[in-house]
């Protein structure tokens, strides 16, 4: 039969989409407006840089680490930009509606779309657990949703515990991680006979993965300190991240060949395994003191992603039909946990060493932080799994996950498969 | 040495508009946060605004938001305050003050290092 | 909402002096100490708490956590008399309303 979509979702998906812009467009319309205040052109440069690396890592760097799966790698790249394009616009308006709206109109800044493009990063990463098993239509519902989530959490966390734009942002990585793992486990999950080679990755798309995780490397110190207020802060964020990164790839390359009985190196544990040291440091890199520090959390941290990536993805396959390839979410998760904890650990130790007696109110503030952050991650996750489900999203059927030919145009092929 | 100068005060009637410059000299502004603190005669000091190193956030006072805007030139290495609608609950000495940062439990402690002498603003009818 | 007290005292030469600080909520050591003459601009004493700026005398300390902090002057110097300002960097920047240290 003739790959292309159904025809309800040929209706269904460019209204829904087109509509949405056109609400976007009215609400932008309405109630934004620039940022008129003077501002030098030197310090405009300099703040566009970091937005621009970030938004080099979301398209580049994430759309391109998805894009393994040997029949499935257009989709991965290009719904990727999609939901990207589409996460940045309403994460502006949601983070604009969320704290500045009582005073009239948002006003849009550089920091504004750093943010959203920061947002937007979330969904990406969460997207890993279900590519391949959902349609553009579906994954519309999943951005919005995911989005709204993500802008919630930070601000209850930043009005209840007070936290600042990085440490309220940080808890992405967590937070990305269970919301996408949560949405995964109400998909379908097994795979129909005939379809598994479908789920393999090949040595192309997977160079292009490799290609990504590169440009993830190169800038991740650039997303761990985006957020933060002063040089110094910005400049111990960017050391220990690239020290962490560094030793999570020699780690990561190191340790995939130990877990081979042949001691050969596995292109997936290596994909993901090279961002582990970045992950892991997000939450304290402006606070570790010292290179050694951040160097070993990268060697623990590239330590447990190739571990994870050996012995975790039998169990994700089975329970939330996860495919082998499609490691970033359990990575996330158990990364994301290890930053929290690495965290905790130096607020106990500064505490300890500063003879302060707040130290049972501080470490309570930070895992009320990380568990509201889990439970609203896995709520909104299973809220985003069951509307997935819907009829009305014309989901692709078992038969045709990760395919490439039932979304896109290819002259070459007269059929499909 | 580093110093701050602040300039463009004086009256100004009520409603009206002010631009206050502060002129940094012995650092340069692209690397330092900066904020703009206020006094009225005969009370305490009222933080009105603050412009990160990178001038990429802004953040201002409840009782001046949407009124005064803090913005900055690196290549005059000068800090502004442009105030409108001014009432007389306005009037104060206005300082500039360099935002300095030092690592603290869990999170970073900011405080006010450098301070400039202060230029007076009046608003009356 | 950030309470200094007193608000003013009267001492005299070689007096110790304690100046207090409450916050409404922890701000965990995120406080800091101004030193205010009449017609002057304010000049910083000690950040982060207890860490005192450089070039400010010793006699000068300052202590606490949470919602609790105190700055004490050991043996009053006549150049101290002036008002002094608690300052919180925990979330947006406030101030205290000042302490007048007063010669009795």
């Known amino acids: 039969m003739s790959s292309k979509y159904p025809r309800s979702v040929r209706r269904c998906l460019p209204l829904w989409a087109l509509t949405l812009e056109a609400a976007l467009i009215l609400l932008f319309y309405f109630f934004t407006h620039y940022d008129a205040s003077l501002e030098d052109q030197k310090g405009l440069v300099a703040s566009y840089q970091v937005g621009q690396d970030l938004t080099v890592m979301a398209a580049i760097g994430l759309g391109f680490l998805t894009s393994s799966f040997r029949r499935h790698s257009w989709s991965s790249v290009a719904f990727n930009l999609f939901m990207l394009a589409l996460g940045v616009q309403w994460a502006i308006l949601l983070d604009g509606f969320l704290s500045q709206f009582p005073s009239g109109k948002v006003v849009i800044t550089l920091f504004s779309i750093r943010l959203a493009t920061m947002s937007a990063l979330s969904v990406l990463i969460s997207v890993d657990a279900v590519l391949g098993k959902v349609n553009l239509a579906q994954l519309v519902v999943m951005v919005l949703v995911e989005v709204t989530a993500l802008g919630n959490l930070r601000m209850v966390i930043s009005n209840i515990f007070n936290t600042d734009y990085h440490m309220n942002m940080m808890h992405i990585y967590v937070f990305a991680a269970y919301f996408g793992l949560s949405v995964a486990w109400c998909l379908p999950k097994p795979l129909p006979e005939g379809t598994e080679d479908k789920d393999q990755t090949a040595t192309i798309p997977s160079l292009s993965a490799m290609l990504g995780a590169l440009f993830l490397w190169m800038f991740w110190p650039s997303f761990n300190s985006a957020l933060l207020r002063s040089p110094i802060e910005r400049k111990n964020a960017v050391f220990n991240t690239y020290y962490a990164v560094a030793v999570s790839v020699v780690t990561a390359i190191s340790g995939s060949s130990l877990a081979h009985p042949q001691g050969k190196i596995s292109k997936t544990y290596v994909h993901s395994a090279v961002l582990a040291g970045g992950v892991a440091v997000g939450t304290s890199c402006h606070l570790i003191p010292s290179p050694w520090l951040a160097m070993v959390l990268g060697l623990v941290a590239g330590l447990i992603s190739v571990g994870g990536a050996k012995y975790l993805p039998g169990c994700c396959n089975r329970v939330l039909g996860i495919p082998h390839s499609s490691i970033m979410g359990y990575n996330f998760s158990l990364l994301g946990l290890l930053g929290e904890i690495i965290y905790i650990v130096l607020l106990v130790l500064d505490t300890v060493g500063a003879g302060n007696g707040m130290i049972g109110f501080q470490v309570l503030l930070s895992i009320g932080e990380l568990s509201l952050a889990i439970v609203i991650a896995l709520m909104s996750g299973l809220l985003t799994g069951l509307l997935l489900n819907l009829k009305i999203w014309k989901a692709p059927h078992e038969a045709k996950y990760f395919d490439d030919q039932v979304f896109w145009k290819f002259p070459h092929l007269a059929v499909g498969f | 040495q580093v110093k701050l100068l602040e300039s463009g005060g004086g009256v100004v009637q009520p409603g009206g508009s002010l631009r206050l410059s502060c002129e940094a000299s012995?650092?340069?502004?692209?690397?330092?946060?900066m904020h703009w603190v206020r006094q009225a005669p005969g009370k305490g000091l009222e933080w009105v605004a603050l412009i990160w190193f990178d001038g990429s956030i802004r953040s201002y006072a409840e009782s001046v938001k949407g009124r005064f805007t803090i913005s900055r030139d690196t290549s005059k290495n000068t800090l502004y305050l442009q105030m409108r609608s001014l009432s007389a609950d306005d009037t104060a000495v206005y300082y500039c003050?360099?935002?300095?940062?030092?690592?603290?439990?869990?999170?970073?402690?900011?405080?006010?290092?450098?301070w400039g002498k202060g230029t007076t603003v009046t608003v009356s009818s | 909402v950030m309470t200094q007290s007193p608000s003013s005292l009267s001492a005299s030469v070689g007096d110790r002096v304690t100046i207090t600080c409450r916050t409404s909520?922890?701000?965990?050591?995120?406080l800091n100490w101004y030193q205010q003459k009449p017609g002057k601009a304010p000049k910083l004493l000690i950040y982060a708490t207890s860490s005192l700026q450089s070039g400010v005398p010793s006699r000068f300390s300052g202590s606490g956590s949470g919602t609790d902090f105190t700055l004490t002057i050991n043996s009053l110097q006549p150049e101290d008399f002036a008002t002094y300002y608690c300052?919180?960097?925990?979330?947006?920047?406030?101030f205290g309303q000042g302490t007048k240290v007063e010669i009795k």
């Open positions: 300052q919180q960097s925990y979330t947006t920047p406030s």
């Open positions: 909520q922890t701000i965990s050591r995120n």
């Open positions: 003050a360099r935002d300095k940062a030092v690592r603290g439990i869990s999170r970073y402690n900011y405080y006010m290092d450098v």
């Open positions: 012995g650092f340069t502004l692209r690397s330092s946060g």
